[in-house]
């Protein structure tokens, strides 16, 4: 898979790690550090944004410590001397668990997201454009370090108030009738950002397509719900969407909607209270006739993980669950390219979305 942005990612780098940030830090640059906290040795790890490889000049030292109940130290080192520590007495990381750590460089500060949630702001103490190196050390194993350049035009999520000049931002802020879910949105107006990963293919197993738009992947341990994003280019024959997640143990229902403007072209609605998978279309706020037939038993189970494939074809959508075809849904809204928004809500935790 190819990561978007101007700099190639560092894949599975050995720790301790030091690597160049090509072009240095820029306003709007987003750097994602994805890895797992080691469960055994050590009680600390650190991510440093520094000048050169010596470690004497560190613009931002981000240092989770599994000590004294757990806390995170942020600091700056100039000419070998540390400044005053800023401590956050909340530990968003867990030993032995994977994490997705995003650093967004902005004119006044670094914004740090852990697993998609704004964790801390660290105001610049030295000019950030001096930074040309990222280093990681301590009790951590890395999967990748990726770079999202602000000049890269990403997919713009539906209902986002963030202008296109910003990096891709998730979750989008809902407008209008959609209610703000508790505990997800940061108090300040800064966007929560998330890395967008482009893969080479535009559909499963597809090397050529028209239009040739690569799928967007949003790799994250957990997503805010409801999750809303645009489908770049809308639907077209051979376009596929892959979602995975876990059904909550007490789940009643969840839904996956493919939308066109105010219409819901495809409403996929597993209902645990009815032991059914309901499919329908809503046009101008009016629901059509439901489709419920299944070739086998209800594939979704409370408390269990699942994956859903939606494959668009000329006449229908094919839907597979856990890699096995489940049903077809013949298009009721036939202007496929206008079906360009994905909405997911209800009693699940999303773990992977690829559009």
């Amino acid at each position: 898979m190819a990561f978007s942005g101007s700099q190639a990612p560092y894949l599975s780098p050995a720790v301790p790690f030091s690597g160049t940030i090509q072009g240095g830090l820029q306003d709007g640059l987003q750097i994602t550090v994805n890895g797992t906290v080691l469960s055994s040795s050590g009680t600390r790890f650190a991510v440093n944004f520094q000048t050169g490889f010596s470690g004497n000049d560190i613009a931002f030292h981000f240092n989770p410590r599994f000590e004294d109940g757990g806390y995170v130290v942020c600091n700056t080192r100039q000419n070998g001397s540390w400044g005053p520590e800023e401590r956050k007495t909340h530990m968003p990381f867990q030993k032995g668990m994977p994490f997705d750590l995003c650093f967004l460089v902005q004119s006044s500060d670094f914004k740090v997201m852990v697993n998609g949630i704004l964790f801390v702001q660290y105001f610049h103490r030295v000019p950030f454009h001096r930074v040309d190196t990222i280093s990681v050390n301590g009790s951590v194993q890395l999967s990748y370090i990726s770079f999202q350049n602000p000049r890269t035009v990403p997919v713009q999520p539906a209902f986002s108030t963030v202008p296109f000049s910003q990096p891709v931002c998730f979750p989008p802020r809902p407008r209008g009738r959609r209610q703000k879910p508790p505990g997800v949105w940061p108090a300040n107006p800064a966007p929560i950002t998330q890395t967008v990963i482009h893969t080479v293919q535009s559909a499963p197993g597809q090397m050529f397509s028209t239009p040739a738009i690569p799928p967007m992947m949003y790799p994250h341990p957990a997503y805010p719900m409801p999750f809303i994003t645009t489908i770049l280019g809308g639907l077209y024959p051979s376009k596929s969407i892959l979602l995975s997640g876990t059904v909550l143990p007490s789940a009643q229902r969840f839904h996956i909607n493919l939308c066109s403007g105010n219409h819901i072209a495809f409403h996929l609605n597993p209902r645990f209270d009815e032991n059914a998978v309901v499919r329908n279309t809503q046009i101008d706020n009016s629901w059509g006739s439901e489709e419920r037939s299944l070739p086998r038993k209800m594939p979704f189970v409370r408390g269990q993980s699942f994956s859903v494939w939606i494959l668009c074809e000329a006449h229908c959508l094919k839907v597979a669950v856990d890699g096995q075809h489940l049903f077809e849904y013949y298009h009721r809204l036939r202007n496929l390219p206008t079906i360009n928004r994905l909405e997911v809500g209800g009693d699940i935790q999303l773990t992977h979305v690829q559009t």
Epitope: P295, K318, G323, H325
Partner: antibody, heavy 117, light 107 residues
């Protein structure tokens, strides 16, 4: 680029064991079924086994049930076929293939297993 | 288990010919049938999925159809690169059986 690379084939005596590996890259391994399909010399394709790495769900052809075990390591993006109590009729080129929900869309180059004394 | 009976086992044809290969499922498999092409010494390639859907990048001269439990692969105008062996596979339920294969040879 999607790639599947098989390894581990070779010559083994009847009753012996062999473990085949299928290293996958270029796609989200855990959300695709991985299938093993074999082809005896000059014969047709025979489906052997499959696994869905995300849930560890497995399924086997009757001819290998109880003798072969399919497994996957999602941290390594690799599927395995452990073959025990091998027989002469297990001699074949073994392919691993990616199971897109509607077909086997990518295949490895195959690895030859020869069971002979 | 579902048996897939493929016919003919081999056929000879010329460039430009229309070629039809059939697979009959021993029981209902809905439309969960795929067709593959294999050339000597090479791995198979997916041509058709869901009985009649053309896989991406496959030339449009290949098509598939279904009538009950009978599935047909048609090559509308045979090209030199189409001489190969073709297999059907049912993907309705495990074990995911293949047909015996049809070898398309040059007349």
């Amino acid at each position: 680029e999607v790639q599947l690379v098989e390894s581990g084939g070779g010559l083994v005596q009847p009753g012996g064991s062999l473990r085949l590996s299928c290293a996958a890259s270029g796609f989200t391994f855990r959300y695709y079924w991985i299938h093993w399909v074999r082809q005896a010399p000059g014969k047709g394709l025979e489906w052997v086994a499959a696994i869905f790495p995300s849930g560890g769900i497995t399924t086997y052809a009757d001819s290998v049930k109880g003798r072969f075990t399919i497994s996957a390591d999602t941290s390594k993006n690799t599927a395995y076929l452990q073959m025990n109590s091998l027989r002469a009729e297990d001699t074949a080129v073994y392919y691993c293939a990616r199971g897109w929900p509607w077909g086997l869309d990518y295949w490895g180059q195959g690895t030859l297993v020869t069971v002979s004394s | 288990d579902i048996q897939m009976t493929q016919s003919p086992s081999s056929l000879s044809a010329s460039v430009g010919d229309r070629v039809t290969i059939t697979c009959r499922a021993s029981q209902s498999v809905s439309s969960a049938v795929a067709w593959y092409q294999q050339k000597p010494g090479k791995a198979p390639k997916l041509l058709i999925y869901s009985a009649s859907s053309l896989y991406s990048g496959v030339p449009s001269r290949f098509s598939g159809s279904r009538s009950g439990t009978d599935f047909t692969l048609t090559i509308s105008s045979l090209q030199p690169e189409d001489f190969a062996t073709y297999y059907c596979q049912q993907r309705d339920r495990s074990p995911y059986t293949f047909g015996q294969g049809t070898k398309v040879e040059i007349k």
